[in-house]
């Protein structure tokens, strides 16, 4: 089996409004070479949430926690969550191409639901 695996271990995450949401993603290899991006939604209308190589994403930070020998952590945290952030988030590996990078493999997705802020 040649393909790396994209592992999004949590099918769903629930976060209170105003809190931060951690979206986990691990990959089994850096090969094939290419960037990793996060999107909300799938298909042509998906929204880019984070691309480390370019862009400005002030609410997103990267969170690499426990380092395991057999995989690589590409998790993110989104701060100050609002109900508008609800949706399914995908961690996507691209393969470096010319002239454009090619989508290689996507994680299964993590559904983010937003609870009302505790009063």
């Amino acid at each position: 089996e040649d393909e790396l695996q994209v592992i999004q271990p949590e099918k769903s995450v629930s976060v209170a409004a105003g809190e931060s949401a951690t979206l986990r993603c691990a990959m089994t290899s850096l090969i094939p070479v290419g960037p990793i991006m996060w999107f909300r939604g799938a298909g042509a209308g998906r929204e880019l949430i984070y691309n480390q190589k370019e862009g400005h994403f002030p609410r997103v930070t990267t969170v690499s926690e426990l380092t395991k020998r057999n995989n690589l952590d590409f998790s993110i945290s989104i701060s100050n969550i609002t109900p508008a952030d609800a949706g399914t988030y995908y961690c996507v590996k691209f393969r470096k191409g010319s002239p454009d990078d090619v989508e290689f493999k996507s994680g299964a997705g993590t559904e983010l639901s937003v609870r009302a802020k505790p009063s």
């Epitope: 040649d2 393909e3 290899s29 850096l30 094939p32 070479v33 480390q52 057999n70 690589l72 998790s75």
Partner: antibody
Framework: EVQLVESGGGLVKPGGSLRLSCAAS????????MSWVRQTPGKGLEWVAT????????YYPDSVKGRFTLSRDNAKNSLYLQMNSLRAEDTAVYYC???????????WGQGTTVTVSS | DIVLTQSPASLAVSLGERATISCRAS??????????MHWYQQKPGQPPKLLIY???NLESGVPDRFSGSGSRTDFTLTINPLQAEDVATYYC?????????FGGGTKVEIK
């Protein structure tokens, strides 16, 4: 015990060819990215080539691109580096190395010496 | 290409003392909080051996007197306390971007 055993090195004239082999044992070869790294007294360690676990993707630095070809046979737990149009600057000890995640080099063979000289 | 500059080129340290080796990258080797910088030990006549992976993680079987630290462009390998069997040349290596590159090496000797 992990073992990587290189072979195929030797003396070759400039413009000539050599085929290096690496026999792997003690780990699941087909799950690992594999690479060659060479070492010279003058230039130190230099990455030479990398191949994905299934053999679909290969990567080379500009210094060897178009001259070297990396392949693998997972059924035989073997890695091969075909080196053509050899130059004096290709003279080095060539190490076979494994990479579980395609990142750090986990295990290295003992190396095989390639000498390019007229 | 990412250039890795190791310093010093050679280092003489007394047994039981601390040896510190620096590796500076010409650009960041960090991605998503991972630092793709690794350290190897090479003894004469032997291949390199992985000591530290991804900046600070000790490879299995490596004594805990070896440690790594740093992020982005500045990394350090520390040996404390130095033992006689640690006499070797140490190399840093980045796998953040192709072509993968190595530092020029630091030779550690006993004072």
């Amino acid at each position: 015990e992990v073992q990587l055993v290189e072979s195929g090195g030797g003396l070759v004239k400039p413009g000539g060819s050599l085929r290096l082999s690496c026999a792997a044992s003690g780990f699941t070869f087909s799950s690992y990215v594999m690479s060659w790294v060479r070492q010279t007294p003058g230039k130190g360690l230099e990455w030479v080539a990398t191949i994905s676990s299934g053999g679909t993707y290969t990567y080379y630095p500009d210094s060897v691109k178009g001259r070297f070809t990396l392949s693998r046979d997972n059924a035989k737990n073997s890695l091969y580096l075909q080196m053509n149009s050899l130059r004096a600057e290709d003279t080095a000890v060539y190490y076979c190395a494994s990479q579980l995640t395609g990142s750090e080099f986990d295990y290295w063979g003992q190396g095989t010496t390639v000498t390019v000289s007229s | 290409d990412i250039v890795l500059t190791q310093s010093p080129a050679s280092l003489a340290v007394s047994l039981g003392e601390r040896a510190t080796i620096s590796c500076r990258a010409s650009e960041s080797v960090d991605s998503y909080g991972n630092s793709f910088m690794h350290w190897y030990q090479q003894k004469p006549g032997q291949p390199p051996k992985l000591l530290i992976y991804r900046a600070s993680n000790l490879e299995s079987g490596v004594p805990d007197r070896f440690s790594g630290s740093g992020s982005r462009t500045d990394f350090t390998l520390t040996i404390n306390p130095l033992q006689a069997e640690d006499v070797a040349t140490y190399y840093c290596h980045q796998s953040a971007d192709l072509p993968w590159t190595f530092g020029g090496g630091t030779k550690v000797e006993i004072k």
